[in-house]
C-alpha cells in the first residue's frame, strides 16, 4: 500500500459529559471516491478498534447504530466525536484513514490524540 500523511491534535480533554471531539485530516494524493476512517485506542501497548466508518466523498460518515462515534466530513477533514467516555477510557486515540476506491490503495495512520477523561464528582446530598 502507499503511505499517506494523517494529522490529528496531540491532546483533547473530554467534556464533563464524557464527549470528546477532534479533527482528523489527511493529505489525499489521489481522487478517492470512498474513504474508510477507523479510530483505534492504544493503552498499555494494546490496540483496539473503537469504531469505523466508510463514506463517499461529499457524503456523511455512517457509523453502525450502536457505535459510540459520530462524525462529519469536509474535503480531506473528518470531524470525529466519541461519546460515553469514562475515566477508564483515557488513552491514545489513533486515526487511521484508508483510500478504498478507486485504486491505488492508500493508508495513513496519525500519531494519535491523547484523550483525557475525568469522571464528574457525584453531587453531594443537599439539605434544605
Amino acid at each position: 500500500c502507499k503511505a499517506m500523511h494523517v494529522a490529528q491534535p496531540a491532546v483533547v480533554l473530554a467534556s464533563s459529559r464524557g464527549i470528546a471531539s477532534f479533527v482528523c485530516e489527511y493529505a489525499s494524493p489521489g481522487k478517492a471516491t470512498e474513504v474508510r476512517v477507523t479510530v483505534l485506542r492504544q493503552a498499555d501497548s494494546q490496540v483496539t478498534e473503537v469504531c469505523a466508518a466508510t463514506y463517499m466523498m461529499g457524503n456523511e460518515l455512517t457509523f453502525l447504530d450502536d457505535s459510540i462515534c459520530t462524525g462529519t466530513s469536509s474535503g480531506n477533514q473528518v470531524n470525529l466525536t466519541i461519546q460515553g467516555l469514562r475515566a477508564m477510557d483515557t488513552g491514545l486515540y489513533i486515526c487511521k484513514v484508508e483510500l478504498m476506491y478507486p485504486p491505488p490503495y492508500y493508508l495513513g495512520i496519525g500519531n494519535g490524540t491523547q484523550i483525557y477523561v475525568i469522571d464528574p464528582e457525584p453531587c453531594p446530598d443537599s439539605d434544605f
Epitope: 500500500c1 502507499k2 471516491t33 470512498e34 463517499m56 478504498m100 485504486p103 491505488p104 490503495y105
Partner: antibody
Amino acid sequence: QVQLVQSGGGLVQPGGSLRLSCAASGFTFSSYVMSWVRQAPGKGLEWVSSISGSGGSTDYADSVKGRFPISRDNSKNTLYLEMNSLRAEDTAVYYCARGGSAWSLDIWGQGTTVTVSS
Amino acid sequence: DIQMTQSPSSVSASIGDRVTITCRASQDISNSLAWYQQKPGKAPKLLIYGASNLRSGVPSRFSGGGSGTYFTLTISSLQPEDFATYYCQQGNSFPITFGQGTRLEIK
C-alpha cells in the same frame, strides 16, 4: 468462516442474459470492495468489474462496459453481475472476489461457468 | 492500461528446487502487486500482497520482492503441492490487470 458462494451460471444463447450472484458470509460485507474476474477455457485471469463497499462507485473492463452492470445489496450480503447481450467470447468461469489489502483479491468464490452458444 | 508480463511462461522443476518467477509492469505500480496460485478446476488463492507481504496461512517458503516495475515470486524449496499456475496482478489503477500466468511443472 469467511466465504463467498456463487450461483447463477449456465448455458445461454448469444444475445441472451444471465444474472450471477455471490453470497458473502463471515465478514462485514459493506466494508469491502468486491470484484468479478473471469477465466476463459484454457486462458488466464481477466478482471471484469469492481464495486466500492457502499455500491456508489463501479468500474468495468472495456470488454464488458455497458453490458455487465455490477451491483450489491449490503442488506443481503450479496454481490451481483447482470450479464446482457452475451457473446461467444464471454464464455468463461466467473469468479467473485473480495478486495483485500493493496487491491489484492483475498477471498474467492468457487466459480460459476457461463457458456454462450447457439 | 498497465500490461503485466510474466516470465517464464512455464518452468519445469524438481522437489526441493528453488524457483523464481518474474513479473514486469509496463509502468510504475509502486508496490501494488499481488501473486496468486491456481490449481486446475479451482479458484485462485492469494499468496502475496503489497509485493512482499505473505498472506496469513501461506507457507514461508513463498516470498515476494520488488517495487516499481519489476517483481519476483520465489519458492525456496518446492513441495509437491506447489505445482500449479502462478499469476501476478497489479492493483495500482483500473483496469486491474493480470500477468499471463506461469505454469510450474514437475521435471
